[in-house]
Interface confidence: low
């Protein structure tokens, strides 16, 4: 089956978080600074006319830009989209902001920068002070935070209101813990390199974040191929060489927000094995309940059968017993010259009572490493509210 | 403003590298620095971009593909090397700013210019 | 290849007059990828129009784009003598896989 099992589709984790329709109150919407009472953070919401009609910060922007508008979403979010406006002022605004840059959290103390697929930092804004710009984020970003820095290339006044729309990210799933994806030659380079991963690298180790393996993006059968528009070969996998892990797997860990039963865990991989890509022989895991806890039991070890020769991608489904854990070790074994993996996703169900590491409150300073990106698609609540999702922008997948 | 420089006359088979010197702006800000050339009494013709960001992507016409290659050389500088070089080759070669929207790897347009160099391709 | 063809040139205005000058492309586009511009002898093209319709800093309001799919038109209205040039459209989209491409340019003679 090439199918990921509860696999979100992207596509529809796109409804309104909050902003407009006020589902999140004032009290999540802060700010570095406001020009006027008139003008603070909780004004700042998409369609709004409240106060002076936006949020304005006290200083310049430019050229510091390190004035924000911070949402807080209380819980984890995956946030696909996000909208911009000018300030209202009963038609009278003139403020507005052509570009910003967006930082994200998981926990309120590491802070991302939201980068495009080529590395762009910078979004463009507005045109004028009414028109709502909706920007999609390719790739998206799991937070339970955003701060928009709105940027100006001159000394002049900017105002902001905004939206942002996703989906909730209830798979639980914090961070990947993987080797850094490697590059495979053929005619033209393929590079398998994990290229949204927002953890830190080290050493050849990526750990702490997620990436391309928890964005929703299902990889082609054809590795060199991508679902995504003007990207570079092999942009849809992380993969790694046999010749380069002597012990002949690879080794990965995941770190999830609480205790949960873990039924299964699925791999979608490439087997274009003309190539070099093979589905893993096997997979190999271990589980226990704390970072500085022994691994517990024996490792779940489960062999892979199937039609092998067969070249299409598939989602390997790899059953973990209901074992109860919230960091996963798994052991990835070679099959072939070169493993390939697009998405990784668990099925689980969270343990009664097991206190949660994000929430309500933050957690407490993350273990290094830490585990896996938020992975599991059917983690995301698609229709939170009854709403619709807002519709895809015109272009490429991620705009 | 952009300047471009290195024009000349030489002959088919020769090489030849085109320099476009920006001032005013930066690329570090994220722009797509191209060449269009203009073969005389002829229309405009896109040769290649580059996005000046973080990394290095370049895109070429087809027809342009292993025989130009571009690059930037510096924070304020943007080459055009020129290989195998016939007559067909003959042209006032631009450098132009490609400003864009949405994320880069889209849409772009050249909102400034330079005043373009002749290369001249003669036996 | 995505290939854009223009509108033959040469077309005539009169002073006052409005004029039309289209693009078409082989395949659809979006809107988004496709610019105008206005190139005089001697000088370097000039932007006109960019995203199919929103007008560039400085130009005048008598310039304006329209279209979507794979056509594409520029209007002058209230033509004057200055607008006596060739016009070229571009469909920019880095690094898709049907390559950037000019239109082959049409030129305005002014009466």
């Known amino acids: 089956d090439a199918d990921m099992k509860g696999h979100f589709d992207p596509a529809k984790c796109r409804y309104a978080l909050g902003m407009q329709d006020r589902t999140i109150p004032d009290s999540d919407i802060s700010a570095s600074s406001s020009w006027s009472d008139s003008t603070a953070a909780r004004h700042s919401r998409l369609e709004s006319s409240d106060g002076d009609g936006a949020w304005c910060p006290a200083g310049s922007v430019f050229p510091k830009e390190e004035e924000y508008l911070q949402v807080d979403l209380q819980r984890l979010h995956l946030v696909a989209l996000v909208g911009t406006q000018g300030r209202h002022a009963g038609g009278l605004g003139k403020e507005f902001s052509r570009s910003y840059r967006l930082r994200y959290s998981r926990d309120g103390r590491r802070w991302m920068g939201w980068k495009d697929r080529w590395g762009q930092e910078v979004i463009s804004g507005n045109e004028d002070p009414e028109g709502v710009v909706l920007k999609d984020l390719g790739p998206p970003m799991v937070a339970r935070l955003v701060r928009f820095y709105p940027r100006a290339d001159r000394v002049m006044s900017v105002c902001l209101r905004v939206e942002l729309y996703g989906c909730l990210w209830r798979d639980g799933l914090l961070s990947y813990t993987a080797p850094v994806g490697q590059t495979m030659y053929l005619s033209e380079a393929v590079y398998l390199n994990d290229s949204t991963y927002d953890g830190h690298t080290v050493g050849g180790l990526q750990y702490g974040g997620l990436g391309q393996l928890a964005d929703g993006v299902v990889g082609l059968d054809d590795f060199r191929k991508s679902q995504e528009l003007r990207v570079w070969p092999g942009y849809d996998y992380v993969g790694w060489s046999n010749h380069s892990f002597s012990s002949g797997y690879v080794e990965m860990e995941f770190e999830f927000d609480r205790l949960r039963a873990f039924q299964a865990m699925q791999v979608h991989c490439n087997n274009m094995h003309t190539l070099g890509a093979r589905l893993p022989g096997g997979v190999e895991c271990r589980f226990r309940r704390g970072p500085a806890m022994a691994w517990e039991g024996e490792p779940m070890r489960h062999n892979l059968g199937g039609n092998l020769g067969d070249p299409r991608a598939r989602a390997v489904s790899v059953p973990l017993g209901g074992r109860v854990a919230r960091f996963l070790q798994c052991r990835f074994l070679f099959a072939g010259p070169w493993l390939l993996f697009s998405e990784i996703s668990f099925i689980s169900d969270v343990v009664n009572n097991s206190s949660p590491a994000l929430g309500g409150t933050f957690p407490p300073a993350p273990w290094w490493p830490p585990g896996p990106p938020p992975t599991n698609f059917s983690s995301l609540e698609l229709e939170p509210r009854g709403q619709q999702p807002v519709a895809k922008a015109e272009g490429s997948p991620t705009a | 403003s952009l300047e471009e420089s290195g024009g000349d006359l030489v002959k088919p088979g020769a090489s030849l590298t085109l320099t476009c010197t920006a001032s005013?702006?930066?690329?570090?800000?994220?722009?797509?620095m191209c060449w269009v050339r203009q073969a005389p009494g002829k229309g405009l013709e896109w040769i290649a971009c580059i996005y000046t960001g973080r990394t290095d992507f370049t895109d070429y016409a087809s027809w342009a593909k292993g025989r130009f290659t571009i690059s930037k050389t510096s924070s304020t500088t943007v080459t055009l090397q020129l290989t195998t070089l016939t007559a067909a080759d003959t042209a006032t070669y631009f450098c132009a700013r490609g400003d864009y929207s949405g994320g880069v790897g889209g849409n772009y347009w050249l909102d400034l210019w330079g005043q373009g160099t002749l290369v001249t391709i003669s036996s | 290849e995505l290939v854009m063809t223009q509108t033959a040139s040469p077309v005539s205005a009169a002073v006052g007059g409005t004029v039309t000058i289209n693009c078409q492309a082989s395949?659809?586009?979006?809107?988004?990828?496709l610019s105008w511009y206005q190139q005089k002898p001697g000088q370097p093209p000039k932007l006109l129009i960019y995203?199919?319709?929103i007008l560039a800093s400085g130009v005048p309001s008598r310039f304006s784009g329209s279209g979507s799919g794979t056509e594409y038109t520029l209007t002058i209205s209230g033509v004057q003598c200055d607008d006596a040039a060739t016009y070229y459209c571009l469909y920019g989209g880095f690094g898709s896989s049907t390559g950037d491409a000019f239109g082959g340019g049409t030129v305005l003679v002014v009466k």
């Open positions: 995203k199919a319709s």
């Open positions: 005013g702006f930066s690329f570090s800000s994220g722009y797509y």
């Open positions: 395949q659809s586009i979006g809107s988004t990828y």
